[in-house]
């Protein structure tokens, strides 16, 4: 016969799970802030840049009170997946000038991927319905010039910073309701 069954698996404390997710999100927010500052130092922005393919900011700070955990986690995961795709695109197609932001951009990508896995785990631990697999997103066109890569980087890091800031606030608020 096989080995004796182990002790029954204790369901982890969802507040502790949420805590570790908040820590990861905070850490990624700090990384993003630092990389955005590095980008500004090397390539000062010549405008307030945005990119149509980026997700719109999920929620204003004032509307945080109405949030529900499933909705927040599902939306956060979808938005961060989009940012992961954009960071990958930036590293691949952003041009030689953005190579000066390595290895930090690579580290950011790895930590973003780690946070996404943590969110997936949290959703399954909380027995939240798993969202359907994302439809394949249309490929992002490469920037038309070196300046295009720089402006895209400003847009992506700026948007990711706002999203993560929103995520930290939202997750902390939801923790108090668990």
């Amino acid at each position: 016969p096989g080995p004796p069954p182990g002790p029954p698996r204790v369901s982890p404390d969802p507040r502790a799970e949420l805590d570790s997710t908040v820590l990861l999100t905070r850490s990624l927010l700090a990384d993003t802030r630092q990389l955005a500052a590095q980008l500004r130092d090397k390539f000062p922005a010549d405008g307030d840049h945005n990119l149509d393919s980026l997700p719109t900011l999920a929620m204003s700070a004032g509307a945080l009170g109405a949030l529900q955990l499933p909705g927040v986690l599902t939306r956060l995961r979808a938005d961060l997946l989009s940012y992961l795709r954009h960071v990958q695109w930036l590293r691949r197609a952003g041009g030689s000038s953005l190579k000066t932001l390595e290895p930090e951009l690579g580290t950011l990508q790895a930590r973003l991927d780690r946070l996404l896995r943590r969110l997936q785990l949290l959703m399954s631990r909380l027995a939240l319905p798993q969202p359907p697999p994302d439809p394949p997103a249309p490929p992002l066109a490469p920037p038309s010039s070196a300046w295009g890569g720089i402006r895209a980087a400003h847009a992506i890091l700026g948007g990711l910073h706002l999203t993560l800031d929103w995520a930290v606030r939202g997750l902390l608020l939801l923790k108090t309701r668990l």
């Epitope: 390539f43 010549d46 840049h49 000066t100 038309s144």
Partner: antibody, heavy 117, light 111 residues
């Protein structure tokens, strides 16, 4: 107040070289893109090129790329334009300028370069 | 390179009237939520002075008589009403792509 003071211009023979300088003051030089723009007598403005704060990205107008070299020394708050193989069509007033959130928003008074034998 | 075509080459306007200068780009200068078209004024013996940045933003210290509009390839600088001090040459410039380029200039005179 932003101040940009170009120097180094003068008379140079065809085929010769010249190095222009632009001394910057009144702002944090190391946080700005810097540009060179020239203007031939009685003509319009021609963008020469630009350099980012840490010199990792330098762009030129293609026709001048092999003749001109843009550089900067952040410790000295100075922008440079090294000109080589000059010809009569390089006779112009050479301006240095900042480039940033408000486009090319500060210009020097210019330094005059005359190419003649 | 992006070619900027300015028109007219020269313009004579009565004091108090409206002056309109056009700048057409050979390809779009819009990207990342901005129109990278700027307008400068240059008086004889002086360096250029920024009037309008990114198509429609008035530079600090510039009178509200100056305004800019347009997107993609077609842009306009309007001066209304024209004053004697506005006699100058006006240039458009695109900074969407390297090399940045200038229009050929429009000389404004008083009728």
């Amino acid at each position: 107040e932003v101040k940009l003071l170009e120097s180094g211009g003068g008379l140079v023979q065809p085929g010769g070289s010249l190095k222009l300088s632009c001394a910057a003051s009144g702002f944090d030089f190391r946080r700005y893109w810097m540009s060179w723009v020239r203007q031939a007598p009685g003509k319009g403005l021609e963008w020469i090129g630009q350099i980012n704060p840490d010199s990792s990205m330098i762009n030129y107008t293609p026709s001048l790329k092999d003749k001109f070299i843009i550089s900067r020394d952040n410790a000295k708050n100075t922008l440079y334009l090294q000109m080589s193989e000059v010809r009569s069509e390089d006779t112009a007033l050479y301006y240095c300028a900042t480039y940033g959130h408000h486009a090319t928003d500060s210009w020097g008074q210019g330094t005059s370069v005359t190419v003649s034998s | 390179d992006i070619v900027l075509t300015q028109s007219p080459a020269s313009l004579a306007v009565s004091l108090g009237q409206r002056a309109t200068i056009s700048c057409r780009a050979s390809e779009s200068v819009d990207s990342y939520g901005n129109s990278f078209m700027h307008w400068y004024q240059q008086k004889p013996g002086q360096p250029p002075k920024l009037l309008i940045y990114r198509a429609s933003n008035l530079e600090s210290g510039i009178p509200a008589r100056f305004s800019g509009s347009g997107s993609r390839t077609d842009f306009t600088l309007t001066i209304n009403p024209v004053e004697a001090d506005d006699v100058a040459t006006y240039y458009c410039q695109q900074s969407n792509e390297d090399p940045f380029t200038f229009g050929s200039g429009t000389k404004l005179e008083i009728k």
